[in-house]
């Protein structure tokens, strides 16, 4: 019942933080415009993985999405990959995890079976989770690094006559979304993996039972039959680092590094 | 048709108070950010105030912080500015202006104006 | 805040001539965002409240004749008017429609030779 509840909760979790990792992809406000300690502008301006967009302060909001792929940056780039593979990772680690689910009965599929669905599912959900809390930190680190580097040269201009002001970008409510569902997710894949366990058919040992026959002395021992399953996963670590691009707008060319973080 | 109507203006004394009204037709009302504009005689345009679809946020210039409130009441279609501690150099003519939808915060409809004159 | 300087205070033309009125920014009103421009230019002639003619620096509001014109980026802005007619003559304001105080040049008036 415990590895049932386990499991079932597991897939539950994985469920949500897949959803959630869905949502924060999609979502444009990966990162936002300071408004803390900068002139205050009738514009806010905001970024996602996909496009970027300018609210008015008379409501109205224009997205423009980045119509290039080789001109954009190689993090951010970096961040889409890692997204865009948890994902998948997680979509096909529920569906494995449907079939696994010890509450469904799918013709004959023995436990065995079962067990090395759920903790395939499991490792599916981890390396997801993983993925997603990746990409969002390596997307937050890009902005903390771009966040200090505008505000040491907060204005820039020609002898300091024509002033520009440098728009400075901070956290946006997708990172934390998918550092949340990034951590469900993970723990989905943990209680998978723990329901695995449970789920494995134990070794079952029968004492030696002995018949007295009148005449012969016969044992009879029957034999042990045990289950077992074993998956491992290697994973490396690879740092990505920013082959730093120009932008692309949808009919010119601007090159700032404020077009995308 | 839109339409903005200004009201409430007149002769104030030097410490005295005022509130201007602005009557709005002709749109959805509650759906747009709302601006007071003043020009003093034979002078250029000062813009006041804003006040966003929602009551919030709302702008001032600095010099009138404190002296001067906008509001609004979108049931009743009016804006309003409410100055306190008048002074001569308020003296101008008051115009409410609408912040259009898509035109880059700029201010697509004015009213005819209500005059402030601050003297004693 | 924003200072917005109009140039020239004042400018004698005479009908079918072609005026360019100039409005310089202390400041960039690029939004990095979008690539827009936030400046405005109104017109305003004698006793009545200004009129919106060029929003977004280049983008003329409906009902605008064609022989308006906005052009700039950053913090030099242009209107032209290809050929003066004589319901033209009026001052015309630009303003910066980025940063709050929204600030408004001190005026060009256009006046018949």
């Known amino acids: 019942m415990a590895v049932t509840a386990c499991q079932g909760l597991g897939f539950v979790v994985s469920l949500i933080g897949i959803a959630g990792i869905i949502a924060a992809t999609c979502m444009d406000q990966w990162s936002t415009q300071d408004l803390y300690n900068n002139p205050v502008t009738a514009v806010f301006n905001y970024q996602g993985l996909w496009r970027s967009c300018v609210r008015e302060s008379s409501g109205f909001t224009e997205c423009r999405g980045y119509f290039t792929l080789l001109g954009l940056p190689a993090m951010l780039q970096a961040v889409r990959a890692l997204m865009i593979v948890g994902i998948v990772l997680g979509a096909i680690g529920l569906l494995v995890s449907i079939f696994a689910l010890k509450c469904i009965r799918i013709g004959s599929m023995e436990d065995s079976a079962k067990a090395n669905m759920t903790l395939t599912s499991g490792i599916m959900f981890i390396v997801s989770g993983l993925c997603a809390i990746a990409g969002v930190s390596v997307f937050a680190n890009m902005l903390v690094t771009n966040f200090w580097m505008s505000t040491a040269n907060m204005y820039t201009g020609m002898g300091g006559m024509v002033q520009t002001v440098q728009t400075r970008y901070t956290f946006g409510a997708a990172l934390f979304v998918g550092w949340v569902a990034g951590g469900l997710t993970l723990i989905g894949g943990v209680m998978m993996c723990i329901a695995c366990r449970g789920l494995a058919p134990e070794e079952t040992n029968y004492k030696a039972v002995s018949y007295h026959a009148s005449g012969h002395s016969v044992a009879y021992k029957p034999g042990g039959f045990k289950a077992s399953t074993g998956f491992g996963s290697n994973t490396k670590n690879k740092k990505i680092y920013d082959g730093g691009a120009r932008t692309e707008d949808e009919v010119q060319s601007y090159p700032s590094k404020h077009d995308y973080v | 048709d839109v339409q903005l109507v200004e009201s409430g203006g007149g002769s104030v004394q030097p410490g005295g108070s005022r509130r201007l009204s602005c009557a709005a037709s002709g749109f959805t009302f509650s759906s747009f950010g709302m601006h007071w504009v003043r020009q003093a005689p034979e002078k250029g345009l000062e813009w006041v105030a804003y006040?966003?679809?929602?009551?919030?946020?709302?702008y001032y210039v600095d010099k009138l912080k404190g002296r001067f409130t906008v509001s609004r009441d979108n049931p009743k279609n009016t804006l309003f500015l409410q100055m306190t501690s008048l002074r001569s150099e308020d003296t101008a003519m008051y115009y409410c202006a609408r912040a259009g939808y898509a035109v880059r915060n700029a201010l697509d409809y004015w009213g005819q104006g209500t005059s402030i004159t601050v003297s004693s | 805040d924003i200072v917005m300087t109009q140039s020239p205070s004042s400018l004698s033309v005479s009908v079918g001539e072609k005026v360019t009125l100039s409005c310089k920014s202390s400041?960039?009103?690029?939004?990095?965002?979008?690539?827009?421009?936030?400046l405005a230019w109104y017109q305003q002639k004698t006793g009545q409240p200004p009129k919106l003619l060029i929003y977004g620096a280049s983008t003329r509001e409906s009902g605008v004749p064609d022989r308006f014109i906005g052009s700039g980026s950053g913090t030099d802005f242009t209107l032209t008017i290809s050929s003066v007619q004589a319901e033209d003559l009026a001052v015309y304001f630009c303003q910066n429609d980025l940063f709050y105080p929204l600030t408004f040049g001190a005026g060009t008036k256009l006046e018949l030779k």
């Open positions: 400041q960039s009103l690029l939004n990095l965002g979008n690539q827009k421009n936030y």
């Open positions: 006040i966003s679809s929602g009551s919030s946020p709302i």
